[in-house]
């Protein structure tokens, strides 16, 4: 007689990443006799909602059921059928709705209130929207990539899963920026922890691990643009902000209600004479990353050493895995490469600012205009931020590695966020069993 | 003091509908969310679904998905809850209670409307 | 969905006497549990919520403690008109759910 194929014995989990820009599903599965073991679980998916993200739907609520509908129904495709009701589904909001809750907590829980029960009418386990702290944000994202790296597993392999994956059981740090905040995590080297906030003890497979991590709200890519206009906006003359980290020949009005929306600009708001302005582009690097460091306060410390704004920040260690914003804008400007000095990055992003803007337009014709007119900005902060606020060096610069995605999933929180709220991650290590009740047949 | 008003009973006949209205008066409608919650004779309580009449985001327990129809008229304050392919089982008393906040419990309940299912 | 148990079915007691009623979830509802009193031909009544917070207008020998997954209804001693079902309610997660029910009786 023939064998018959067992069906397949896998389970599934779903996470609604809920930032500031945008929303973004994925899809997990694992085998569901391996659940303890580590590095078997992987995406399969990734949907990205269309749309901004949920914390701008504070005016049109009755629209966030039909914003999730088409990634959820991706999801309702993707599992089985059969497998539906088992399958737990979390949604973690970040950094945006953070500001939300900071200007009203009641609307904020109105959004998470729509959400909630939005997402409660699919067939899944939904186990609930919360808005994650800073904190969980930056440690998840670290147990992701460390999970995704096999950092966390006893056997040391003789070969490398990744290019850039160095062979033994250092941990990397994590560097996570979004749109509203950005985090750095890692295991300092015997570094005692000044802060206690910046703090996290964990135990994982049967070793111990001391984190330090802090998440900087306000200090995502596009809530530091918006601080930059606003700071920058108080010594223009009149209505014309002439701005380096914009293409030369980029012209675009901007409201000052709208500038003063968000509580990141909050410490430069003023009176100003008129109620729009135009960013007027002159594409100067040199000019822009100095602008970009007048939102770094380092003239006070309270610690032995801090990144910036008095927040401690111990002697970096190891290597260091940049994902999300960080990834996608190095990217765009093709400077994701190993190879590529800190020195080099420098001088190509010279080159590229200073590019004219219907130069730029030609060149990346299929690129949102929105979008393609903020990497002069973007790729500069990241440059500053690395360097002067987090302390990377010419030289620990090519400890930083660029990531998109590790074996096919993801480098971001969601991951961390789903092995945690599942219990995949044992404290102690499994005992290896040479087989699996699965096994036998 | 916001109150909630029910139609009356109903008898109706199995593989029909039933259409059950709850007035709100004296409050602000639109701000907080009208659940629907049923009880059959001797038994414990169950909830059916809900929705936030400011935004007509309703959502059902999977039990009822496809059978139960809540909206809302916010110009009336009235909630509405329509049950279809009515069985015997159906027969229960139907309330409506009002849920203000996120994640709140229901703190106030209309009188409750008898629902029998009878052929 | 989270499956809450109560227990016991039914509590015998006379008036002036101490009733602990108690509530246990399948996985944490953090605090967001309620607990409404239902007398026969009426609708349920809103005693406790948040686990610990009386309702308005209930009388101070009705308390609520616990998290996570355990929660008890006390009530300090019995009047004749507390003898009633209470059920608990979670709204941590949808669906919402209640229990099945404590019947308290006249001894």
């Known amino acids: 007689t023939q064998n018959k194929a067992l069906p397949e014995n896998v389970k599934y989990g779903i996470v609604l990443d809920a930032g500031s820009s945008h929303t973004s599903l994925y899809i997990y599965k694992w085998p569901a006799e391996k659940e303890n073991d580590t590095g078997v679980v992987h995406q399969v998916e990734e949907c990205r909602v269309k749309g901004p993200g949920i914390s701008k739907f504070v005016q049109k609520v009755n629209e966030i059921g039909i914003y999730l509908t088409d990634c959820m129904e991706r999801a309702r495709e993707v599992i089985p059928r059969s497998q539906h009701q088992e399958t737990p589904v979390y949604l973690g909001a970040t950094a945006g709705m953070r500001l939300l809750r900071m200007e009203s907590e009641e609307l904020a829980d109105r959004v998470l209130d729509v959400v909630e029960r939005s997402l409660s009418n699919y067939p899944f386990d939904f186990q609930g929207a919360r808005i994650i702290t800073g904190q969980e944000e930056g440690a998840y994202g670290w147990i992701t990539i460390n999970y995704l790296l096999g950092k966390f597993s006893q056997k040391t392999r003789w070969f490398s899963i990744v290019p850039y994956e160095t062979n033994n059981q250092e941990t990397f740090g994590a560097l996570d920026l979004g749109g509203a905040s950005t985090q750095v995590t890692f295991v300092p080297q015997n570094q005692t922890i000044e802060s206690p906030d910046n703090a996290l003890q964990f135990r994982l497979y049967g070793k111990d691990y001391n984190v330090y991590t802090h998440s900087f709200l306000c200090y995502g890519k596009d809530q530091a643009l918006w601080q930059k206009l606003a700071k920058d906006i108080q010594v223009a003359s009149n209505e014309i902000l002439r701005d380096p980290c914009f293409h030369p020949g980029y012209k675009k009005v901007v409201n000052v209600s709208d500038l003063y929306k968000t509580p990141c600009t909050k410490r430069f708001e003023m009176t100003l004479p008129f109620q729009q302005f135009e960013i007027q582009g002159i594409g100067n690097y040199q000019q822009c990353h100095q602008s970009i460091l007048e939102l770094f306060n380092t003239s006070y410390c309270p610690y032995s050493q801090c990144a910036f704004n008095g927040i401690f920040l111990p002697p970096l260690q190891g290597d260091f895995g940049a994902f999300s914003a960080f990834y996608f804008v190095m990217k765009f400007l093709n400077l994701t490469s190993e190879k590529v000095s800190q020195e080099k990055v420098t001088e190509m992003m010279k080159k590229f600012c200073a590019q004219p803007w219907e130069e730029i337009k030609t060149s990346y014709a299929g690129v949102k205009e929105k979008y393609l007119s903020e990497y002069c900005f973007s790729g500069t902060y990241i440059l500053s931020l690395l360097l002067q606020g987090y302390h990377f060096t010419a030289d620990s610069w090519e400890h930083i590695h660029f990531i998109g995605k590790i074996q096919g999933s993801d480098a971001g929180w969601t991951l961390g966020y789903m092995l945690n709220l599942t219990n995949m991650i044992p404290a102690e290590q499994p005992l290896s069993t040479p087989l699996s009740h699965s096994t036998y047949v | 003091q916001v109150q909630l008003v029910q139609s009356g009973a109903e008898v109706k006949k199995p593989g029909s509908s039933v259409k059950v209205s709850c007035k709100a008066s004296?409050?602000?409608?639109?701000?907080?969310?009208i659940g629907w919650v049923r009880q059959a004779p001797g038994q414990g309580l169950e909830w059916m679904g809900g929705?936030?009449?400011?935004?007509?985001?309703?959502n059902y327990a999977q039990k009822f998905q496809g059978r139960v129809t809540i909206t809302a008229d916010e110009s009336t304050s009235t909630a509405y809850m329509e049950l279809s392919s009515l069985r015997s089982e159906d027969t229960a008393v139907y309330y409506c209670?009002?849920?203000?906040?996120?994640?709140?419990?229901?703190?106030?309940w209309g009188q409750g409307t008898m629902v029998t299912v009878s052929s | 969905e989270i499956v809450l148990t109560q227990s016991p079915a039914t509590l015998s007691l006379s008036p002036g006497e101490r009733a602990t009623l108690s509530c246990r979830a399948s996985q944490s509802v953090s605090s967001y549990l309620a607990w409404y009193q239902q007398k026969p031909g009426q609708a349920p009544r809103l005693l406790i919520y948040d686990s610990s917070n009386r309702a308005t207008g209930i009388p101070a020998r009705f308390s609520g403690s616990g998290s996570g997954t355990d929660f008890t209804l006390t009530i300090s001693s019995l009047e004749p008109e507390d003898f009633a079902v209470y059920y608990c309610?979670?709204?941590?997660?949808?669906?919402?759910?209640f229990g099945g029910g404590t019947k308290v009786e006249i001894k």
């Open positions: 209670a009002r849920d203000p906040v996120r994640r709140s419990p229901f703190d106030i």
């Open positions: 004296g409050g602000t409608f639109s701000t907080y969310a």
């Open positions: 929705i936030i009449p400011a935004f007509g985001t309703a």
């Open positions: 309610q979670q709204s941590f997660l949808w669906p919402r759910t």
